[in-house]
């Protein structure tokens, strides 16, 4: 046969669906490798091809599309569960082909196992709201194309375990779930359950949504620097460990990236000759402000040590801030005394 | 300095209505969600109702839901309360204040007394 | 929705004596609890929040403490301007709920 293009396995699609559920999966062929989709590429001539490894073991097998209530089905670039086993978990490759041209990729299948409170090992998508903003809509997430619109699904939503009724802030809304004036006590897993007929059969999706509650665009602010700062002076003698701590306050931005970083006579920690260790930790305050600590220490300070400038800086997407630390040689010279 | 004071209190009959205004000075009003707090003579502290920062959500106490509205016009920085088919268990002094999260009702006006009685 | 208990009802504290005054949840509220200060004819003040910080202006003889559903308000030296009617008050779930309040009186 001829040569046929293989995308591999695409791990990036980690496809994860529930046992005993309906799972509608496309081909990734047509989203992410190919410049055309389906329609044209059926137009052309060119035939979809399916077949599967299961878990554990290296031999390709055709899908069995012949199965009882045609359980499992290929619809264009679509192949449906109806629903799901178990054992359906493993990886399944779409070839598309025709006797000059071929191209396939294979992709994981997980059929991921629930108890009654929704909990097992789906990853969940999270979705970061602002807290004491007005109002804000989650929606059931990867439900389009399971039913035609002229169905009307019941929708249950659930906090956790409980089936959200009479929540004072939190008000289903069909697909929607809206949440007015939030707060951190909202955080955690919202579930949606979605039932539809189809063919005289009741079919249930379960899609779940991690909340997280975090800090308000309007309490952004540049970075906050609480040490070092002007009331601490780092008094040493030579040949002390010298330790100065650069703690950083940032508040929440989405898809800020929070940077900290010492100079020393204005240079970067790696393009000076003095052996500097350099420790960084991270702390985060229920709705996602950022506390980050860089410890710049020095084994043995020498008096040259005691005479560089040290600076912290810090940068978020609001701005900068520099505060230098009060380093002197003890004995030498009066400023004022060192207080903590 | 912070100030909320608020307006338009008195003696209506039942069933009638009545709107609260609480003007806010000292501070910008668009960053602070708001509230409405009342006590009934000799008794302790209900929440009313709460208004985002953005006048976009709303939440009441079951007591008066249906029967008032919070809103606030941040360009006149003011916050009202519109009181409708007003009950005599509704007679207390309304206040309004400000909260943040963080910090829940840290500022408070002088509060205004609403009657209800035939 | 969530209920705060204050207790005692009253408190009798001599001048200069110490006031412990409690305050429990129905469920846990985390550290999402605050104290005021009412006096007659008065609006409340804002005295602890988050549990255990002082409000601005509050002084130090105020100190909050507890977590969950338990939590204590202590005035460690009562001067007279103290005594007056606290309220704890739980912002950690909508609706925002307070206590019955704690009357504080001279004995």
């Known amino acids: 046969s001829e040569r046929c293009d293989d995308w591999g396995l695409d791990t990036m699609r980690q496809i994860q669906v529930f046992e005993d559920e309906p799972a509608r999966i496309k081909c990734p062929l047509f989203e992410h490798f190919l410049k055309y989709n389906y329609s044209t590429a059926h137009s052309s001539g060119l035939t979809l091809i399916w077949y599967w490894t299961r878990q554990d073991r290296d031999l390709e097998e055709p899908i069995n599309f012949r199965l009882p209530e045609n359980r499992i089905s290929k619809e264009k670039d679509v192949l449906w569960f109806r629903p799901t086993l178990l054992n359906d978990t493993g990886n399944y490759t779409c070839m598309l082909r025709n006797t000059t041209y071929c191209s396939k990729v294979a992709f994981p299948l997980e059929v991921v196992q629930k108890d009654s409170c929704f909990n097992s090992a789906m990853r969940f998508p999270v979705h970061k709201m602002y807290i004491e903003h007005g109002i804000h809509k989650i929606t059931c997430p990867n439900v389009d194309g399971y039913f035609p619109s002229s169905v009307k699904p019941s929708v249950t939503w659930y906090k956790g375990c409980t089936e959200i009724v009479d929540f004072h802030n939190v008000l289903p809304e069909g697909m929607n779930l809206s949440f007015f004036i939030p707060l951190v006590s909202n955080n955690g897993n919202y579930t949606c359950v979605v039932t539809y007929p189809e063919n005289g059969r009741l079919f249930h999706l379960t899609r779940t949504v991690t909340v997280k509650v975090v800090g308000s665009p309007k309490d952004a602010l540049p970075p906050q620097i609480y040490s070092p700062n002007d009331r601490v002076v780092y008094e040493k003698e030579p040949g002390e460990e010298l330790v100065i701590p650069c703690k950083v306050y940032f508040s929440f931005i989405m898809d800020s990236h929070n940077e900290v970083w010492w100079t020393i006579d204005g240079k970067k920690p790696d393009d000076v000759t003095v052996d500097i260790t350099i420790n960084e930790s991270v702390s985060y305050s229920s709705t996602e402000d950022e506390t980050r600590t860089q410890i710049l220490s020095i084994k043995k300070v020498t008096p040259e040590d005691l005479r560089r400038n040290y600076v912290c800086h810090a940068r978020n997407t609001k701005g900068e801030a520099e505060q230098a630390a009060k380093v002197k040689q003890k004995g030498n010279g009066c400023t004022e005394p060192m207080t903590l | 300095e912070v100030q909320l004071l608020e307006s338009g209190g008195g003696l209506v009959q039942p069933g009638g209505s009545l709107r609260l205004s609480c003007a806010a000075s000292?501070?910008?009003?668009?960053?602070?969600?708001m509230s409405w707090v009342r006590q009934a003579p000799g008794k302790g502290l209900e929440w009313v109702s709460a208004i985002s920062y953005d006048g976009e959500g709303t939440l009441y106490a079951d007591s008066v839901k249906g029967r008032f509205t919070i809103s606030r016009d941040n360009s006149k920085n003011t916050l009202y309360l519109q009181m409708n088919s007003l009950r005599a268990e509704d007679t207390a002094v309304y206040y309004c204040?400000?909260?943040?999260?963080?910090?829940?009702?840290?500022?408070w006006g002088q509060g205004t007394l609403v009657t209800v009685s035939s | 929705e969530i209920v705060m208990t204050q207790s005692p009802a009253t408190l009798s504290v001599s001048p200069g004596e110490r006031a412990t005054l409690s305050c429990r949840a129905s469920?846990?509220?985390?550290?999402?609890l605050a104290w005021y200060q009412q006096k007659p004819g008065q609006a409340p003040r804002l005295l602890i929040y988050g549990a255990s910080t002082r409000a601005t202006g509050i002084p130090a003889r105020f100190s909050g403490s507890g977590s969950g559903t338990e939590f204590t308000l202590t005035i460690s030296s009562l001067q007279s301007e103290d005594f007056a009617v606290y309220y704890c008050?739980?912002?950690?779930?909508?609706?925002?709920?307070f206590g019955q309040g704690t009357k504080v009186e001279i004995k």
């Open positions: 204040a400000r909260f943040r999260y963080y910090t829940a009702f840290d500022y």
């Open positions: 000292g501070f910008p009003l668009s960053n602070y969600g």
């Open positions: 008050q739980q912002y950690n779930n909508w609706p925002w709920t």
């Open positions: 469920q846990s509220v985390s550290s999402n």
